[in-house]
């Protein structure tokens, strides 16, 4: 099996407005070298949700929980969820370069928002 897998185990997550949503992502290898980024939506209009290296993402925190040697946890938590946050979130592995290039995306997790 060639190179790495990006695993988003949850097809969907439902969260009450005002609560936090945890979006899970594990990656089976650091190779090829490069960062992980989170996006909402796909294609050229997708919205960057979190990038470890740069940017200001006050509602997003990292929630690594994995103690397994066979994978690494790149999950995030988004606080104070509102209906505007609904959508499909993708964990994306990039290959380092100038510029970094997208290497592999997870299958996506659909976030739905329930009324309080």
């Amino acid at each position: 099996e060639e190179e790495l897998q990006v695993i988003q185990p949850d097809k969907s997550v439902s969260v009450a407005a005002g609560e936090s949503a945890i979006l899970h992502c594990t990656v089976t290898s650091l190779i090829p070298v490069g960062p992980i980024q989170w996006f909402r939506g796909a294609g050229p209009a997708r919205e960057l949700i979190y990038n470890q290296k740069e940017g200001h993402f006050p509602r997003v925190t990292t929630v690594s929980e994995s103690t397994k040697r066979e994978n690494m946890d790149f999950s995030i938590s988004i606080s104070n969820i509102t209906p505007a946050d609904a959508g499909t979130y993708y964990c994306v592995k990039f290959r380092k370069g100038s510029p970094d290039t997208e290497f592999k995306s997870g299958a996506g997790t659909e976030l739905s928002v329930r009324a309080k």
Partner: antibody, heavy 118, light 112 residues
Framework: EVQLVESGGGLVKPGGSLRLSCAAS????????MSWVRQTPGKGLEWVAT????????YYPNSVKGRFTLSRDNAKNSLYLQMNSLRAEDTAVYYC???????????WGQGTTVTVSS | DIVITQSPASLAVSLGERATISCRAS??????????MHWYQQKPGQPPKLLIY???NLESGVPDRFSGSGSRTDFTLTINPLQAEDVATYYC??????????FGGGTKVEIK
Amino acid sequence: EVQLVESGGGLVKPGGSLRLSCAASGFTFSSYVMSWVRQTPGKGLEWVATISSGGTYTYYPNSVKGRFTLSRDNAKNSLYLQMNSLRAEDTAVYYCVSSMTGSSFDYWGQGTTVTVSS
Amino acid sequence: DIVITQSPASLAVSLGERATISCRASESVDSYGNSFMHWYQQKPGQPPKLLIYRASNLESGVPDRFSGSGSRTDFTLTINPLQAEDVATYYCHQSSEQLPWTFGGGTKVEIK
């Protein structure tokens, strides 16, 4: 049981070449990132090269880039390090190392000694 | 390059006491809460052996008297209580996405 057996070390003159081999057994070689790490009494441990599980991606520090080439043959469970334009500072024990994720160096061979001297 | 400063270079500890080894990286080796710092033990005439991966996770088969802690730039390996078979040289190693991957200079642990 994971086994990594290095071979190909020896004495070579500056400017010369060597090819190190590593025979792997006891694990699914084609699923593992593989590396070489070397050790000298003066410089301690130094990462030398890493190759992805499928062999597509290779990485080297500047100290060996352009001189060393890492390759693998997953059908033969083998890893190879071609070392050209060898220098005295390449003298070291070279370890073959397997890594499930490319993060930590999980299992190490016993090492093979490379001596570069005129 | 990320430079790792490991201290002390050598350490003499009484049997049954605590041994503490530190590694400081010149910049953070964390990503998404994962700390890409690892610890190895090397006994004379043997290759290094993985003890702790990603700062605090004990490798399978390693006694639980070994523990690791820390994040970002500061990391610690603790052996408590120290046993005779723990006499060895210990190395830390960072594998952040910033190449090259680098090692600390090693700490030689002896019995006092």
